[in-house]
């Protein structure tokens, strides 16, 4: 994400088009309180961060309110008056959507439709991952809206599901972050379960007459 400038590595995360977090890792300045200066308009004066993140007692990042912005963040990380990293970035290219809310499951025979509240902005993928104890890895299906139908399930098996949201790479690029996963929920025969057995129970032997 952020290449080195005087040994400074930066990371930007734009949480759900609400809050921007810029963090830095500067080995050369590891015991220094670097300051963060920013503006959203190239013609304005820089403001200094009022909400610093601290690591081992020294500044390591800044949190900014940036509600529903699709503009450029101009920023400068400084050691006193000396800029050690200066850049401007389109914030949306560092989007991390919020975790899916109001996840619901609607069962119909060997299929389940997973729905949740769509986020207020677009160009997202809603991904459902699922597995049974018989599966060696998670299966995945994704759609452009939070309405994902998974077919071909075995009604007798217990399945674990979780959901997340991803920014479409074609639009937002490779520097975004998927949302955190929703809580895992387990289902069997259309009913919610506390958990799925980690190891599948072997089939009961048929008793010979």
């Amino acid at each position: 994400q952020g290449g080195a400038a005087e040994g400074v590595q930066i990371q930007i995360i734009y949480f759900n088009l609400e809050t921007v977090q810029v963090t830095w890792n500067a080995s050369k300045y590891s015991r220094t309180n670097l300051t963060f200066h920013y503006r959203f308009n190239g013609d304005e004066a820089y403001d200094q961060c009022t909400n610093y993140l601290l690591q081992e007692g020294h500044t390591s990042g800044c949190l900014l309110d940036a509600e529903q912005r699709d503009d450029i963040l101009y920023f400068s990380i400084r050691n006193g008056t000396h800029p050690v990293f200066t850049a401007s970035r389109w914030m949306v290219y560092y989007l991390k959507p919020s975790s899916p809310k109001h996840v619901r499951f609607s069962w119909h025979q060997d299929a389940v439709t997973v729905t949740c509240s769509d986020l207020s902005y677009g160009d997202l993928l809603y991904e459902v991952q699922y597995r049974s104890p018989f599966d060696t890895e998670w299966q995945s299906k994704q759609e452009n809206t939070c309405n994902v139908t998974i077919e071909g399930l075995d009604a007798e098996k217990c399945y674990s599901f979780w959901v997340r949201v991803k920014a479409m790479e074609d639009v937002y690029g490779p520097d975004t972050y998927p949302s955190d996963w929703s809580e895992v929920t387990c289902w069997q025969r259309g009913e919610i379960r506390d958990a799925c057995a980690e190891t599948p129970t072997p089939p009961k032997p048929k008793l010979s007459k």
Epitope: G3, D71, Y74, T86, A87, S88, W90, D123, V171
Partner: antibody, heavy 118, light 107 residues
């Protein structure tokens, strides 16, 4: 096919106005940052203006600030550049371009020629 | 504004030659550098972005390297269709700025 097609270039007198259009096709226009650039005859490339995907944020080169206005109509898949108080030094081929994640301009139109002369 | 200095500004080479063009930035720009090819009367074409990532559809004989202030575009084996003008562009800090160009001509 992803395509940008500029129009509106012409011969105009100093102090005059012109409106350039850029019609986009083959991609979801309203999802992308868009840019105007230009190239004076025999010279290099120069960035002119950029607009965010929603149209809510605009950026201009110092040389055109206060004279040029970039805008877009996402329902018509069209980008515009309104050019006022034109000067001889604005004579150039004007290109519209699509932004690639803030790391380059990956699709360019064929260009439209603007000549400012009396 | 960040200045980009390209060198050489003019280059004479033969088909099959290995060609290297340099772009120097007046201050650190991380890896926010793009390279374009432009032929006479045509629009620029993106070759490389993020200093070293090849744009889809661009032949693999083109490569980019560098970070910070010094960058290079290399054409491993020059082809007849590669004779053109090449520009670097920084996008680390607005306004985006271009280098002055390098014209590659046939020897």
């Amino acid at each position: 096919e992803v395509q940008l097609l500029e129009s509106g270039g012409n011969l105009v007198q100093p102090g005059g106005s012109l409106r350039l259009s850029c019609a986009a096709s083959g991609f979801t226009f309203g999802s992308y940052v868009m840019t105007w650039g230009r190239q004076a005859p025999g010279k290099g490339l120069e960035w002119v203006s950029t607009i965010s995907a929603s149209g809510g944020s605009t950026y201009y080169a110092d040389s055109v600030k206060g004279r040029f206005t970039i805008s877009r109509d996402n329902s018509k898949n069209t980008l515009y550049l309104q050019m006022n108080s034109l000067r001889a030094e604005d004579t150039a081929v004007y290109y519209c371009a699509k932004d690639k994640w803030g790391k380059g301009f990956d699709i360019w139109g064929q260009g439209t020629m603007v000549t400012v002369s009396s | 504004d960040i200045q980009l200095t390209q060198s050489p500004s003019f280059l004479s080479a033969s088909v099959g030659d290995r060609v290297t063009i340099t772009c120097r930035a007046s201050q650190g720009i991380s890896s926010y550098l793009a390279w374009y090819q432009q032929k006479p009367g045509k629009a620029p074409k993106l070759l490389i972005y993020a200093a070293s990532t090849l744009q889809s559809g661009v032949p693999s004989r083109f490569s980019g390297s560098g970070s910070g202030t010094e960058f290079t575009l290399t054409i491993s084996s020059l082809q007849p269709e590669d004779f053109a003008t090449y520009y670097c562009q920084q996008l680390n800090s607005y306004p985006p700025t271009f280098g002055g160009g390098t014209k590659v001509e046939i020897k």
